[in-house]
Every structure is written in structure tokens, then in C-alpha cells.
């Protein structure tokens, strides 16, 4: 039985040209996290963090994606095209797969404040 919950940074905004941290947190389960996948809105994989093998940043994103902090992902040099949904997929043992959603809005305005709070989707 899957008892865990994915908490995410929910809906966040950040400035064009800036950076943002995408963060998911698995709680309420003792399951072991074996792998975390990060996907973009078009379902293309940005990165994988395998507990035994390490991080893999897909080549198309290597110049703008940095691993961490933790199991999270840092997007850099944001463009307006980065606006959209991002998904974290947690492969766990023995529970199975958990999935979280984050919506990122990239703003032109210099007054955009990076708002990030954990929420349960």
C-alpha cells in the first residue's frame, strides 16, 4: 500500500534570465527512493538521479540544468519557453512510483519575486 505523499514547491514564478529550484519531497513513507526522474511539460526528461549510479543530466539541458540541492533540480538562465509544468517521479521500494507536479511561470518583469512554498498537490 502506498502511504507516502509528494510535497512540491507548487506554483512558482521566477525572472527571465534568473534561476529557480525545483524541489519535491516524499513524506509519510519509509520506502527507499531508488530513482528520481525530472520531466519537462512536453514529457522530455531533464535529469535522472539514481541512488546507486548518480545524476544524469540529459545533454540537451546540460548547460542550463544543475543537479541538486538534494534530489531537486536547479534551472538556470530561464527563458519564457521554460514556463510550464514540471514533474518529479519518485521510484521507490517497496511502494512503487510517486509523482509530483510543479508549475513554473517565467516572468519578464523585474519585480517578479521567486515564490516557493511546499504544498501537497
Amino acid at each position: 500500500m502506498m502511504t507516502g505523499t509528494i510535497e512540491t514547491t507548487g506554483n512558482i514564478s521566477a525572472k527571465k534570465g534568473g534561476s529557480v529550484i525545483l524541489q519535491c519531497h516524499l513524506s509519510s513513507t519509509m520506502a527507499q527512493v531508488t530513482q528520481v526522474n525530472w520531466e519537462q511539460h512536453d514529457h522530455s526528461l531533464l535529469a535522472i538521479r539514481n541512488a546507486e549510479l548518480g545524476w544524469h543530466i540529459y545533454p540537451a539541458f546540460k548547460d542550463r540544468v544543475a543537479p541538486g540541492p538534494g534530489l531537486g533540480l536547479t534551472l538556470q538562465s530561464l527563458t519564457m519557453n521554460d514556463t510550464g509544468e514540471y514533474f518529479c517521479t519518485y521510484h521507490t521500494y517497496p511502494d512503487g512510483t510517486y509523482r509530483g507536479r510543479i508549475f513554473l511561470e517565467v516572468l519578464e518583469s523585474s519585480v517578479a519575486e521567486h515564490s516557493a512554498r511546499f504544498q501537497i498537490p
Epitope: 531508488t34 530513482q35 549510479l53 545524476w55 544524469h56
Partner: antibody, heavy 119, light 107 residues
Framework: DVQLVESGGGLVQPGGSLSLSCAAS????????MNWVRQPPGKALEWLGF??????????EYSASVKGRFTISRDNSQSILYLQMNALRAEDSATYYC??????????WGTGTTLTVSS | DIQMTQSPASLSASVGGTVTITCRAS??????LAWYQQKQGKSPQLLVY???TLAEGVPSRFSGSGSGTQFSLKINSLQPKDFGSYYC?????????FGAGTKLELK
């Protein structure tokens, strides 16, 4: 053109040592995990280990069959991968391939170099 | 360690025919499975990764399927150049392991 070319194979006596090299070209070497895989004559492929990429600190992992005897290293300035093999045994006789991995599957392979361990 | 069991060990087929090779993982590996083709005296070549994604330049007569512990590689409309050995490999944990191989021969 993406290419991997191994060298350094040959005949070695049991207990001896040998170093294999793999010259990489056509891609950004530091972005990729680099692996060694071997294949004894007429047998299956066996993953020996890898050295991680720059983002993962160039750390290494090895299979149990070679851990402590084999060492993987890389010269990033020259785009060369190495496999230092010590305390060689007859069962180490095989064709040795270097392979680039993307998300831990092997998307580019070298042509292979042959090691024979025999007295 | 995750063990990969391939079957059959060998099979013979005719040009134009269809074959299916199966691979079983000893543990759940989601869709993290790759298939390789190796011709006699040559290096292996990546065919499929993530269980069903064809590698660049691989013809559509090859198809991969499966998830969890059971996987298969299907080759339709066999061509003379398709004969050789095929290996599966999981890309999910350490150590990375291959199946024992399937030798596809011309009938």
C-alpha cells in the same frame, strides 16, 4: 563523428598487469560516464565499471568480479579513458570494449581490444 | 544484483520472418532496459533503450516492449543483416548487468 578506439591489448602471464586505453573523439568527453565492458570468447557481455562525468565528480564504480584488481581513470584534457588491470587471471581473457553511456545504457562502443592471459 | 535472463539462447528464422526475444529481470526495473545487436567479430550496437525507444538510425522493424520484470524485442520482416546475437541490459542500478544473449541464425 563520435568515435572510441581502444588499444593496449596483448598476451600477459597470469599474475601480470596491463593497462588499456580508449581514445574518444567527436563529443564532449567530460559530459559522459565512461565504461569498460568485456566479452570472453563466445560468451556474454560483462560490465566491469564506469567513471562518472564532471557533474558527478569523476567517481568510479566497479563490478564485484574486478573490484580491487582493476582501476578506471580518465585524462579529460586528452579525452582518454584507461583501465589498469592487475593480478590478471586466465578468466580475464576477453575482448575489452570501452563504451559511452547515456543514462546508463551504452550508446557508443569502441572497436575492442583483445587480452589473453596465459603462461 | 539484478539478474537478467534471456530466452531463447538461440533460434533460427528465415529472411522475411518475425522473431521475438524475451528478457526477464530478477527485480522490478520499471522500463529501464536496453537491447543491443552484435554481429560476429563486431562491437555491440544499441538498438533500444527505456524498453521501447529506438536508438537513432534503428529501423522500425525493431520494436521493444514490456515493463517491470518482463521485456521483449520483436523483429519483423527479417533482413540478412539482422542475424547475429542480441543482448538485453538493465540500466536501473549498480551493477549494470546483461543477459546471456540470444543467437539469431539463418534457417
Amino acid at each position: 563523428d563520435v568515435q572510441l578506439v581502444e588499444s593496449g591489448g596483448g598476451l600477459v602471464q597470469p599474475g601480470g598487469s596491463l593497462s588499456l586505453s580508449c581514445a574518444a573523439s567527436g563529443f564532449t568527453f567530460t559530459d559522459y560516464y565512461m565504461n569498460w565492458v568485456r566479452q570472453p570468447p563466445g560468451k556474454a557481455l560483462e560490465w566491469l565499471g564506469f567513471i562518472r562525468n564532471k557533474a558527478n565528480g569523476y567517481t568510479t564504480e566497479y563490478s564485484a568480479s574486478v573490484k580491487g584488481r582493476f582501476t578506471i581513470s580518465r585524462d579529460n584534457s586528452q579525452s582518454i579513458l584507461y583501465l589498469q588491470m592487475n593480478a590478471l587471471r586466465a578468466e580475464d581473457s576477453a575482448t575489452y570494449y570501452c563504451a559511452r553511456s547515456t543514462a546508463w545504457y551504452f550508446d557508443v562502443w569502441g572497436t575492442g581490444t583483445t587480452l589473453t592471459v596465459s603462461s | 544484483d539484478i539478474q537478467m535472463t534471456q530466452s531463447p539462447a538461440s533460434l533460427s528464422a528465415s529472411v522475411g520472418g518475425t522473431v521475438t526475444i524475451t528478457c526477464r529481470a530478477s527485480e522490478h526495473i520499471y522500463s529501464y532496459l536496453a537491447w543491443y545487436q552484435q554481429k560476429q567479430g563486431k562491437s555491440p550496437q544499441l538498438l533500444v533503450y527505456n524498453a521501447k525507444t529506438l536508438a537513432e538510425g534503428v529501423p522500425s522493424r525493431f520494436s521493444g516492449s514490456g515493463s517491470g520484470t518482463q521485456f521483449s524485442l520483436k523483429i519483423n520482416s527479417l533482413q540478412p543483416k539482422d542475424f547475429g546475437s542480441y543482448y538485453c541490459q538493465h540500466h536501473y542500478g549498480n551493477p549494470l548487468t546483461f543477459g546471456a544473449g540470444t543467437k539469431l541464425e539463418l534457417k
